[in-house]
Every structure is written in C-alpha cells, then in structure tokens.
C-alpha cells in the first residue's frame, strides 16, 4: 500500500504521562506509513532528493534503500499541565499531529 | 546504527537524464538511514511527533511503526540542460541533496 | 507543462493485441518516468506499466507476462503492448508522465485524456 496517513490516538495515560497533563487525556496524533517505490505519483509528495533515491533502489536495490513515508505537514496541540513549581500552564506543543504524508 | 547521513554519488548517465542534462555529469546526493529507535538522543533531530510515536511503539511495537529516518535539511543543484526548443538553460532544482537527516 | 496525447485505443476480440501509443511535448526535460494506468467507472486508477528514462519497467500484477511498456526517447512516445487481452482488461487507459518538482517542493504528475480499450468475448 503506498504512503498514507493512518489513524493514532495516543493517550496520555499509556505514555505515563498524566500525572504532569492535565487536559486533554490524549489526542489524534496520526502516523505515516505506506511504501516509497517505483513508480511514484503526485499524491505520495516526493521531494526531489526522494524521486532520485526511488530511482537509484529501483535500478539497484543494493545501494541504497526506498526513501521513507514520513510526515509532511504537522500540526501543534494545546497541552494544559503543571509546571516544576505545580502552576497551571497552558502550550502549545508544536509538530504533535500529522497532517500529510510524503515520500522523503 | 542510528539514523545518519550516508555517502551517495549519483551519476546522471545512471538515471538516463544524459540527454537533456548537460552538466554536471552527477551530484553527491547523500540519503539517510537507520535507526529511530528508544531512547532518542538529540542527534536524531526527532519531531515531536516522532519522539511521540517512538514511545507509542516502544510500548506496544503493534500499534505503530518506529518514525522513520529522513532528510530534515536538503539543498539545491544547479543543473545546465538543454529545454523542449533546444536551449541551453542553467536551472536551480530544489531539494535534491541531503544536508541533514532526523527521524520522522 | 507537459501535453501528452494517447492512440491506438480500440474494440479487439479477447485473446487479440493492440498497442498504445504516448506522445509527450512541452518541458520534457525533466521527466522521470512514463506509464499507462487505467480505470473503470466506479474503482481507482491503477498502475498497468511505467518505465523510467533509463529503460527499467516495473508492471502492475494485470499487466504481467502479458503487456511490454517501451519507449522511443527520439519520439518522446512511450508503448504499451498488449496481448492475450481478456474482456477485464476493458478500461480507459491513461498515459502518466512523472517529473521533478519545480519550482515546487514536490514531484508533478501530467495525464492525457485516455483511450479507450474494449475487449469483446
């Protein structure tokens, strides 16, 4: 199946991180995963360097492997937790969500 | 091994391009490979998401693949080629050489 | 921009052959593979053959052992050969040509219009 965008929701809980966040228990984080192989097309947003590295593995496998399916785009999330000195805070957290895939 | 930056040359005779492009015969692309496995270490340049889905697959390897290792940094080649009307035009391509990899 | 103008679509009995023809034009330059995809109404397009500038084919599992994908870089057309045609091979088929992104990040696909291949039994 080629490079695509799968569902992941993370809990909080199962990283062992709720005792330091507070909201949200978990989130959609989404991952990235599908192959990067000859021939690619305009939905699997190959990078240039990506196009070349699929063409080198596919003439001969040997020398290098496929490019990977990896994020594109991500997106921040909202992280309302305690601090070393037990205050509220609220951040955002950048790169947390997938938004697109790609062949890089 | 970690992910990391490896040696490739890429001739362009190789790829079939020698009749359009002029110059240079091929370009030190480089591609990236290895591991992004737990514990990440700063040298691995892991996203957010990337450190996320790291624990998430560490915890149960099912659910996800480990992040994969990519180019976080890529630069330009200027190539002399001839165009569709036969001239000779000196052209930048983006993102066709790996200046640094992380995982993804 | 690349144009790309597909022929030698058709009706043909099951068991006969047709050859498809590609010819591309524009900024050809930078084309890295060519193929023929193909699609029925109400399922996705998918991969019958491509070939890349150096002459590496890859075939999709319908295409294998029966249709040969070549090109004539002096053309600019691509082949798709096709024999032992069976009526589940009736499809509008597509020629794909893939290049290098610029100045995008991205690699860009141009389609022809399609031809239409219809295998009677």
């Known amino acids: 199946q080629a490079c695509k965008k799968h569902e992941l929701y993370v809990s909080f809980r199962d990283l062992g991180w709720q005792d330091w966040i507070i909201a949200p228990e978990g989130y959609a984080a989404y991952y990235c995963e599908g192959e990067c192989a000859f021939p690619l097309n305009s939905y699997m947003n190959a990078t240039n360097h990506a196009i070349v590295q699929t063409l080198v593995h596919f003439i001969n496998p040997e020398t290098v492997p496929k490019p990977c399916c990896a994020p594109t785009q991500l997106n921040a999330i909202s992280v309302l937790y305690f601090d070393d000195s037990s205050n509220v805070i609220l951040k955002k957290y950048r790169n947390m969500v997938v938004r697109a895939c790609g062949c890089h | 091994q970690a992910c990391k930056k490896h040696e490739l040359y890429v001739s362009f005779r190789d790829l079939g391009w020698q009749d359009w492009i002029i110059a240079p015969e091929g370009y030190a692309a480089y591609y990236c490979e290895g591991e992004c496995a737990f514990p990440l270490n700063s040298y691995m340049n892991a996203t957010n998401h990337a450190i996320v889905q790291t624990l998430v697959h560490f915890i149960n390897p099912e659910t996800v693949p480990k992040p994969c290792c990519a180019p976080t940094q890529l630069n330009a080649i200027s190539v002399l080629y001839f165009d569709d009307s036969s001239n000779v035009i000196l052209k930048k391509y983006r993102n066709m050489v790996v200046r640094a990899c992380g995982c993804h | 921009e690349v144009q790309l103008v597909e022929s030698g679509g058709g009706l043909v009995q099951a068991g006969g052959s047709l050859r498809l023809s590609c010819a591309a034009s524009g900024s050809i330059f930078s084309i890295v593979s060519m193929g023929w995809y193909r699609q029925v109404p109400g399922k996705q397009r998918e991969l019958v053959a491509a070939i890349t500038s150096a002459g590496s084919t890859n075939y999709g599992d319908s295409a294998k052992g029966r249709f040969t994908i070549s090109r004539d870089n002096a053309k600019n057309t691509v082949y798709l050969q096709m024999n032992s045609l069976k009526p589940e091979d009736t499809a509008v088929y597509y020629c794909?040509?893939?290049?290098?992104?610029?100045?995008?990040?991205?690699?860009?696909?141009?389609w022809g219009k399609g031809t239409l291949v219809t295998v009677s039994s």
């Open positions: 794909n040509s893939y290049g290098l992104g610029y100045p995008g990040d991205y690699g860009i696909d141009y």
